[in-house]
Each structure stands twice: as C-alpha cells, then as structure tokens.
C-alpha cells in the first residue's frame, strides 16, 4: 500500500507563438481544478477507461479574473498534493491523464459550469521511495509543469511497497535472514509470510500464505509471464507444462466488487460499478464525504457531509456513473461482444475481435481448431472462442513451437530438486520421498506408502516422469 | 418485416406508475438498440434513452433519470419503459424505436405510440 | 447538450413545389444525423440516414445533404403526401436531440 503524489507547479501558456485565450475573463470570473488518473503498465488506453490504480481530484484553486488586454499568465492553482492511494503493489510502470478544469463562476442557471481546458498523459516508469520526478506536458497552446512521486505507507517498504517493516525487537541487530529497512535503519523487514515459492519479484501478499501477481504474472507462484504466453485466452491459470494460459475463471466471476458493486468484465481486466458512497478499483473505499472530492470531471457533490451520510454526485452531461467516472460515448452501450474493443469512427462503430471471434459485432465463435496446426506433436484443443494447443512434454507456446522450462512451476514435492529433461522433467528426492514428483513419504520401515519403486530404482533415487 | 408494436394507451392518476411496452418482431431484437422518445402534446419529440437489448446497458437524458426505467426481456423480444410518480407533464405519447448498434442508422423503424394521460 | 436549430418552423407550399428545410446543430456532427417525418396522429418514420442516405422504401424526390454542422432536406417536387411535419435529429452524442420541427402545409 502506498500514496502517488502529484504536485502542480504552473499551468499556463506555452512557449512559442499563439499565446491562448485567458479561460477566465471580468464577466465570467473561473477558478481551476484538476484531476489526475492513473493506470496500471504502460498500455496505451483511451482516456476514459478505468483509473484502475485510482483517481484524485484537487480543491478548487484560486478565483482567477482577467486583465483586459493582458496576455494569459499563469493561473493561480489550488493549494496542496493531489494524492491517490494505491491498496496493492506499485506496478513500477504507470500511465497518467491529468486534467485541467475550469470552473466558471458567472450566474449561471442551476450552478456552476465546468469545462475541460487541457488533458494531458503519458507513461513512465517509477520506483516507489524514489525521489520527486519533474515533468513538463503540453495539451495545444498550455503548459502544464508538475512533479510527482509513488511513496509506501508503513510498514510497507520498497520499490513495489511489497516489503513489510516492523520496529526492531533487539536494539542491536534484526533477527535471523532479515535486512534492515532502508531508509528506515532502526526497522527491520518483517519475515515474510507469502506462501512457499511465490516470486519475490512478481508476486506479494497482504494475508499469510497467499500469492498475488504483479501485472503481466500468473501463475500460483507468479512464474508465469503472461506476455510470453501465446494461448489466446487472456484468463489465469497458467498450465504447469506448458507456460500457456489455459481458460479458467473470468474476471468478474467471484465478484470482485465489495459493498455490493456490480461487475462487468472489460477487454483487459473487470470494471465495477459501486453503489452510492463507496469507490476505488474494488468499491473498496468508503466513508467518503464530498470534502473528498469523490466526484469527477466536474460532477457536482451533494450530501456526504460526514462519512455516515451517503454522498450523490450529479454529472455533467456527457458523464455517468456514481462518480462521475465514465464518458458518456457511443461506445457506452458496449454493442462488442465476447469482449471485443469497440471503436468510434465518427460516421460509424466498429468492433475490433478477440481472437477466435468475428462478425460485425464480434457475435460469431470461430471454429477454433479449424486449419490450426499444433507442432511438435500437440493436439488443438476448442474452446473459449480461441483455440489453444495442448502441447506434447517439453514443448510450450500457441503453436507447440517453444521449448518450455517444466520445471518452472516448481513441481517436485516436498523439496524435491527438478531438473529439466529431453523428455519432460526429472525429479530428484528429498531424503524420506519418492515417486515422480517425490509425492509419497517412504515408510521408516522400507515400505512405501505407493505406489512401489520400479525395478532397478531406490527411493530417493531420481524418477523420470514420462 | 419488422414491427414495433406498442401497448395501448394509459389512463393514470398522478403518484402512480405506468410500465410501457414493446414487441419487436421481423428483426434479430439484440442486434439493435431500443430508443424511447416522448411527445407531449402539440409538441416536438424529446429523447430520453436507450438500451442495448443484448446487454442491458442503458443511456438516459440526464432530463429523465430517477423516475424512468428502461428494460427489456429478450425471451419475448420486448422492451420495456416504466414510469413511477407520474406527474401531469408526464401526459404525452411515447414512441419506441430501433436503431442499429453499429453502423448508427437513424431511428428507422417506430412503434405506433402509446398515449399516457396522467389526470386525477 | 447539441442544441438542433431548424428552420423555417413552418412553411405553405404547392404540389409540384421545391421545399428546402434547414437544421443547424450547436457544434459539428460528422454526418450524424437523420431525418424523420410525422403525420397527424401517426408515428414518425425515418427517411434519411447519416445525412444524406435514403432510408428503405422512402421516394428518391428526398434527398439530404450538409456536412459539419449544417444540413438540409430536400424534397424536389412536393406531393400530396408529403404534406406533414419534419424533424431532423443528431445522433453523434448523447443525449440525441431533435429540431423543434416544421410544418409543410398546402398553400
């Protein structure tokens, strides 16, 4: 867990020729907000997919009249962070959309007006407990400087905020196998409690024994690179042979949504959809007031004086959701099925297929298996709108064209060694196992609890598994 | 050949709800959106939503949300408009019509209209 | 929302007459845009698409064109049953809107 923190240093014109218009004038005084959205990797997305790492919105800034005949100065911003807190890992990579809002303040009918005056968004790459990072983003004839850092809340630590720290229990030194925590000397990192062999790259936990996957992970252990699987089934789990994502669950099975959110699934991921006063990725986050700012792109906050009184956001036109979260487009009424990306083309939509999908609306199921070949003897497998391989010992990939490392899934019990073979996989026995994946204890009195050693082979000897 | 057929004319006091309806047939009922478009008498059309039939997404005018639901039933190829805590302005007719959900054609096919009087 | 600003509201013409009804949309629609016409009592019936399409069935004596946020419908030589009244409608964002309609009577 940990805080990404964005601080606005200047917003105004541009260099060079053009200077824009002041967005404020002496009839129509306005003050400036901003939002900032940001995003898990470094996918390019379009503007109005989820903030799935989370979203914040400033205070309002300054009432700000122009200077007749004055040039556009720099406007006057609002006080403070904007903060976005992050539950899980910092992914490292992100992608963000800062927006620049205007807020007129002249009489207008039902309230305020809000407009859109600069977006900006880029990708980057950024270490949690790093420095301030300094960016400059220009949006048209504006300028937009600012800084911005990913920091962990204790005990978190780390470049992912993955690491625990507690208070050292010996003034002098940290137990056994546990460093000190960097910067935070006088702690030690707690001792982990992930479950056996999950990825101390790729994976985390927050509750003892389990294993989350960082993006582009998979796998129980969090192996498995997602990217370099070649099924076309974007679902977990991964299939210990084959380094290839098999279907399995989708992303809204379970319910991911807390506090009653209903989920959808999207092209990448899932999207909730969360009842009044509850928001974040999950619908995880409650006890919201308007003070908060919940609403975004200049919805108007209603209610919600304190965390026990539910808060209503009114949109704009244009906007929905229960914060305001979602442009309202052509797109909205999501005419692409079986998960295919919907594209306005301005005279028309589009729908662009997952594999295994056509038709107009992506409707029809492709015979999946049809003029596929799977190599190096794997068998094609229906299903699932994408046709996935199974492939023979040894081999991995969409086609069976890869040589797959079996023994990534780290496969032999009880601290059996693996050792990879032209064949499959060899597993080498702790003392007190056997079996081909060193799965039964020997008996102390010889005898094996099953099934009995080959001919020729002792227990604890290696098994090849064919 | 497609059809819209609509339920027949209402009759409502005011605080009471009305639930329109309206049979498609002729057509694949998913493949289009389903809009709802009022008009009051002697007055223009006014748009007030749509739905994706094969979703159930929906789309209101921020001029009709709360009090107006829409729905439909894809067994029976129907949609649905239901309207609680009808006020006297809610009097008009209210027409459904289909649109296709990709290549955007304007409203091609309408039902009849189904007129509401709301009255006490 | 995009105001559709149509004009004239009504106007008296002739069987045989050229009749040219403008719609302005508050900003450009790309060709999103139908137009609909309604009889007395009767539904209205779409008559042309994204423009300047013909919707099925609809007589070739209409025809539609403008781009951006101008557009007009043409009917090329008035017949008797085309006296009734005509909307345009933009379909480019929501909330769809509809002009305020005109009113073909006979001279």
């Known amino acids: 867990a940990g805080v990404f923190e964005l601080q606005i240093h200047s917003f105004g014109p541009g260099p060079g020729p053009g200077a824009p218009r002041s967005p404020c004038s002496a009839r129509l005084p306005c003050r400036l907000f901003f939002r900032v959205c940001l995003k898990p990797g470094l996918s390019e997305e379009a503007a109005e997919s989820p903030c799935a790492l989370g979203a914040a919105l400033s205070a309002r800034g300054p009432v700000y009249t122009e200077q007749p005949g004055a040039p556009a100065p720099d406007l006057p911003l609002p006080d403070g962070l904007l903060q976005v807190p992050f539950r899980d890992a910092w992914p490292g990579t992100f992608s963000f959309i800062i927006e620049t809002w205007r807020e007129e303040l002249g009489d207008q009918i039902g309230g305020p007006a809000w407009s859109l005056l600069a977006r900006v968004a880029g990708r980057r790459r950024l270490a949690a407990g790093g420095p301030w990072a300094r960016d400059i983003q220009r949006a048209g004839a504006w300028e937009l400087r600012f800084s911005y850092r990913a920091r962990c809340e204790p005990p978190a630590v780390g470049t992912a905020c993955t690491r625990l720290c507690r208070p050292r229990s010996a003034p002098s030194r940290c137990g056994p196998g546990l460093r000190p925590c960097a910067p935070l000397e006088d702690e030690c990192e707690a001792p982990l409690v992930c479950r056996a062999g999950c990825s101390p790259e790729h994976g985390f936990c927050e509750q003892p024994g389990e294993c989350r996957c960082l993006e582009g992970w998979t796998g129980p252990l969090c192996t498995v690179p997602v990217s370099t699987s070649s099924c076309l089934s974007p679902r977990g789990p991964s299939s210990a042979t084959t380094g290839c994502l098999v279907p399995g669950p989708g992303p809204c099975d379970g319910n991911p949504c807390a506090n009653g959110g209903s989920c959808s699934e999207t092209p990448r991921s899932f999207e909730c959809t969360c009842p009044r006063g509850f928001y974040g990725l999950r619908c995880e986050v409650s006890g919201v007031t308007c003070a908060d700012g919940p609403c975004f792109n200049g919805g108007l906050c209603v209610g919600g004086a304190d965390p026990d009184s539910a808060y209503i956001c009114h949109c704009p036109p244009g906007f929905q959701g229960s914060n305001c979260e979602k442009r309202v487009d052509r797109c909205s009424l999501q005419p692409c099925r079986n998960g295919g990306l919907c594209l306005d083309l301005g005279h028309a939509l589009r729908c662009r297929c997952r594999a295994g999908f056509a038709g107009p609306r992506c409707e029809h199921d492709l015979d999946d298996c049809a003029g596929r070949a799977c190599a190096n003897g794997g068998t094609c497998v229906e299903g699932g709108g994408a046709h996935r391989c199974s492939c023979a010992l040894g081999f991995g990939g969409r086609d069976c064209r890869e040589r797959a490392d079996p023994c990534a899934a780290r496969p032999c019990a009880h601290g059996g060694r693996c050792y990879a073979h032209f064949s499959g996989l060899v597993c080498a026995c702790a003392p007190g196992y056997m079996g081909a994946r060193c799965e039964f204890p020997v008996h102390p009195d010889g005898a094996s609890a099953l099934p009995a050693a080959p001919p020729g082979l002792r227990p604890g000897d290696p098994q090849r598994y064919l | 050949e497609v059809q819209l057929v609509q339920s027949g004319s209402e009759l409502k006091k005011p605080g009471a709800s009305v639930k329109v309806s309206c049979k498609a047939s002729g057509y694949t009922f998913t493949d289009y959106y389903m809009n709802w478009v009022k008009q009051a008498p002697g007055q223009g059309l006014e748009w007030m939503g749509i739905i994706n039939p094969y979703s159930g997404v929906t789309i209101y005018n921020h001029k009709f949300k709360g009090r107006f639901v829409l729905s439909v039933d894809k067994s029976s190829n129907t949609a649905y408009l239901q309207i609680s805590s009808l006020k006297a302005e809610d009097t008009a007719v209210y027409y459904c019509?289909?649109?296709?959900?990709?290549?955007?054609?304007?409203?091609?096919?309408w039902g009849q209209g189904t007129t509401v009087t709301v009255s006490s | 929302d995009i105001q559709m600003t149509q004009s004239p509201s009504s106007l008296s013409a002739s069987v045989g007459d050229r009749v040219t009804i403008t719609c302005h949309a508050s900003?450009?629609?790309?060709?999103?845009m139908g137009w609909l016409q309604q009889k007395p009592g009767k539904a209205p019936k779409g008559l042309i698409y994204?423009?300047?399409n013909l919707e099925d069935g609809v007589p070739s004596r209409f025809s539609g064109s403008g781009s951006g946020a101008d557009y007009t419908l043409t009917i090329s030589s008035l017949q008797p049953e085309d006296f009734a009244d005509y909307y345009c409608?933009?379909?480019?964002?929501?909330?769809?809107?509809f002009g305020g309609g005109t009113k073909v009577e006979i001279k």
């Open positions: 994204h423009g300047a």
């Open positions: 900003q450009g629609i790309s060709g999103n």
């Open positions: 409608v933009q379909y480019a964002q929501f909330p769809y809107t």
């Open positions: 019509a289909r649109q296709d959900s990709l290549l955007d054609y304007a409203m091609d096919y």
